[in-house]
Each structure stands twice: as C-alpha cells, then as structure tokens.
C-alpha cells in the first residue's frame, strides 16, 4: 500500500481467483482516542471501532472511502483504490491502446518545436468517474523539471457503438536549450483513477524524436508567364524553433490530381519556393521536416490549382 | 501567490436560491481539493462542503445535504456552491478554501483560504 495523495491509498493486489489481498490498517484522522467508529462509503454499517482498523482488501467492494466517526460527527476521510496486477502485468483498463507507432501505445506526445514545450495526448472510452494527474521530467535518477498543465478533454469521437474521448495536456521543460543535444529522455507519467481503480502509465521519449512541425504558412501561388508552370512559395510556421538558419526545415511539395488514383508529382526542396506544373482541378499542397533529423512530416498546407 | 477569490454572495429571501463562486489561480486547481466553510457572527467557522480532486466526489455536511451542491470546473479554476431552500439560518459569510487533502471536513486541512463572500438570508 502506497499513499498516491493526502488520505489517498493504493492498495496493489495480486488479482486471481482466492487471492488472499493484503491487511491494511487505517489511522482515524483526530486526538480523539475513545468512541471512534469506521463505516464504508454512504453504509451506515459500523465496521469497526478504535481508532485504527484493520481490513483484508481482497476485492473493489473492499475499496472505498472509509469514513471514522464520534457521536454522529465524522471526523476524517481515507480513500482506498485498487490497482491490479494480473499475471505480472499492471492493468490498462483505463486507457486505449493507440496502437502506433507500435503495440502498448497508450500516451502519445508531439512537440512543434525544440523550445521544451509538447503535448501528450491518451484515448478512453470512459465518459465519467474519471480523474488523470500528469507529472513529467528530464531523466529519471537525478530528474530535471518539467511542468505540466491539468489533462483536459480534447475531443470526443464516435466510434461505431462507441463514444471515444481524447485527453490532453501540455508540458514545458523548466530551463530547455534548444540547440543542445539530448543525452536523458523525458520522462511522462499519468496516474488514472476511474471510479475505485487506480492505472499508470508513462512515456520516455527524446523531443527530437517526438518533432512534428506546423504545416508551412502563408502558401501563396505565381503563375509564371507563357507557361503551364507555377511558382509556389511558403513560409516558416510562426511556431517552428529559430534562427532559421540553425533549426532549418526541408518541405515537400505535391501536385494533385481531383482524383486519388491520379498519379501525385513530388518535389523536395530545401528552399521556400519550388516551380512546378499546376494541372486544371489539380491542387498543390506543402509540408515540413526538420532537415537534419527524420522525425514526423507536418500536414499539408494546401492550394487549389485554379 | 496562490489567490482564491470568492463572489456571488448578497441579500436573499428564505426559500430563495444563491450561487457562489470561487476563482482559483497560482495553484495546480485540478491537483487541490475545494470546501466552502462558513462562519456566522459570534460562532465558530464551520464546514459546509468540499469537492476532492478526484471526479465527482463530495461531501456535505449534515445541516446543508439535500440543499446545497458543491461543483468545480477544472477548465475554469472556479469552484460553485449552488444553495437551494435557503433558510435565516444560512446567513454567514461563505469562505473557500483549497488543500492537498483528500475530503476534510476540518480547517487545518486546507492550505489556502479565500477573503469571504456574505450571504444574508431574511425571513
């Protein structure tokens, strides 16, 4: 048993038929000494009196808010939630398995920049009774700070029968420098607690690696004269790490058909403009890379041909 | 500097309704448990409600169960006490409070405290 908040437990249990729990022992929350009874949740059942009591936590029906009492006066409030091992493996009941990049994907995190600042984000078909506590750093042994902002619900999807619900948070590494090389991971960790259940979950990741930039902005087109060509030209998304010079991007440029069969013209460049063939119905569309480290493509910022 | 700033309290008729609000700010709100106390003049500080930070879980004091509603709003910071059936004896002014613990129903457990909002109720 483990203290997850002030008056909030984490009972871990072996979780198999006729396992035998564990004891533990509350402590009532006064100088009172004499008269102390404990009931369970809104039961008005007295379970025990003094001012300690002691339960066997086989089940969630023994989680709960134990509640000790005087003379019709409570005097103080212990929580008590579950968190499941069966074997050997924690539960992931809680959150859906995002399933990419790989198996076992529960949080999924993204920066837009080297500035330190990212956003992780977890999937539950849970719409109630649901509670999520963010904490991150840099490294594990000797952390460096990392602050995060409360989850918050992002979205909310149907999924066939299902309504799917998208958390989010936002994180910013206390003192990042962006420019230096990375050497520890950030570490995220998120505590769920649904209804008496407890879960948690983390992520290690490099920011370098969890990169996606905007899509690039301001896409202009100059149709060249004399010619079917056109020049197209972009800028830097506001939110992408400067000095361009240093944290540069490479863009690739795409000519598209109305159709999706139709076959797709890629070009890649290093610069903010390329010349290209606008086809009729046909659009162009954008997107951005860091240029020195493969990390995730931008989306498309695009324009119609026309 | 962690600030709670109540609002909503005024002159209100018996039987009548009030809801009373409490901005938050320079704390991590979704981290803290909220609780409204009240004091009446010449007595002792009372508790009235809190709300943990864990969802939807709360607790009333007898003398106000079946009348008043705590809620929060962890998007806005604000925590409400909606009170219904007002009677002369709710007259108080209504404090909030903040703390790391998880349902206390005593002072000593709250951290932080609000200036106060006056609610009168007149028969």
């Known amino acids: 048993i483990w203290e997850l908040k002030k008056d909030v437990y984490v009972v871990e249990l072996d979780w198999y038929p006729d396992a035998p729990g564990e004891m533990v022992v509350l402590t009532c929350d006064t100088p009172e000494e004499d008269g102390i009874t404990w009931t369970l949740d809104q039961s008005s059942e007295v379970l025990g009196s003094g001012k300690t009591l002691t339960i066997q936590v086989k089940e969630f029906g023994d989680a709960g808010q134990y509640t000790c009492h005087k003379g019709g006066e409570v005097l103080s409030h212990s929580l008590l939630l579950l968190h499941k091992k069966e074997d050997g493996i924690w539960s992931t009941d809680i959150l859906k398995d995002q399933k990419e990049p790989k198996n076992k994907t529960f949080l999924r995190c993204e920066a837009k920049n080297y500035s330190g600042r990212f956003t992780c984000w977890w999937l539950t078909t849970i719409s109630t009774d649901l509670t999520f506590s963010v904490k991150s750093s840099r490294g594990s042994s000797d952390p460096q700070g990392v602050t995060c902002g409360a989850a918050t619900l992002s979205a909310e999807r149907v999924r066939g029968d299902n309504k799917e619900y998208e958390y989010s948070v936002e994180c910013q590494e206390d003192s990042a420098c962006p420019a230096a090389e990375e050497s520890l991971p950030i570490e995220v960790m998120v505590d769920a607690v649904h209804k008496l259940k407890y879960e948690n979950y983390t992520s290690s990741f490099f920011i370098r690696d969890i990169i996606k930039p905007d899509p690039p902005k301001n896409l202009q087109l100059k149709p060249l004269k004399n010619s079917r060509q056109v020049e197209v030209s972009w800028e830097y998304p506001d939110t992408w790490s400067t000095p361009h010079s240093y944290f540069s991007l490479t863009f690739c440029v795409q000519v598209q058909g109305k159709s999706k069969r139709e076959k797709k013209d890629r070009v890649f460049t290093d610069k903010t403009s390329a010349t290209v063939i606008c086809r009729k119905n046909a659009s162009i569309s954008v997107r951005a890379q860091d240029r020195y480290y493969s990390s995730s493509w931008s989306e498309w910022a695009s324009v119609p041909c026309s | 500097e962690v600030q709670l700033v109540e609002s909503g309290g005024g002159l209100v008729q018996a039987g009548g309704s009030r809801r009373v609000s409490c901005a938050a700010s320079?704390?991590?709100?979704?981290?803290?448990?909220m609780a409204w106390f009240r004091q009446a003049p010449g007595k002792e500080r009372e508790f009235v409600a809190a709300?943990?930070?864990?969802?939807?879980?709360?607790d009333y004091a007898d003398s106000v169960k079946g009348r008043f509603t705590i809620s929060r709003d962890n998007a806005k910071n604000t925590v409400y006490l909606q009170m219904n059936s007002l009677k002369p004896e709710d007259t108080a002014a209504y404090y909030c409070a903040a703390g790391q613990r998880y349902l206390s129903r005593v002072s000593q457990g709250y951290e932080y405290w609000g200036q106060g909002t006056q609610v009168t109720v007149s028969s």
């Open positions: 320079g704390l991590t709100f979704s981290d803290y448990s």
């Open positions: 709300h943990a930070w864990l969802a939807s879980t709360t």
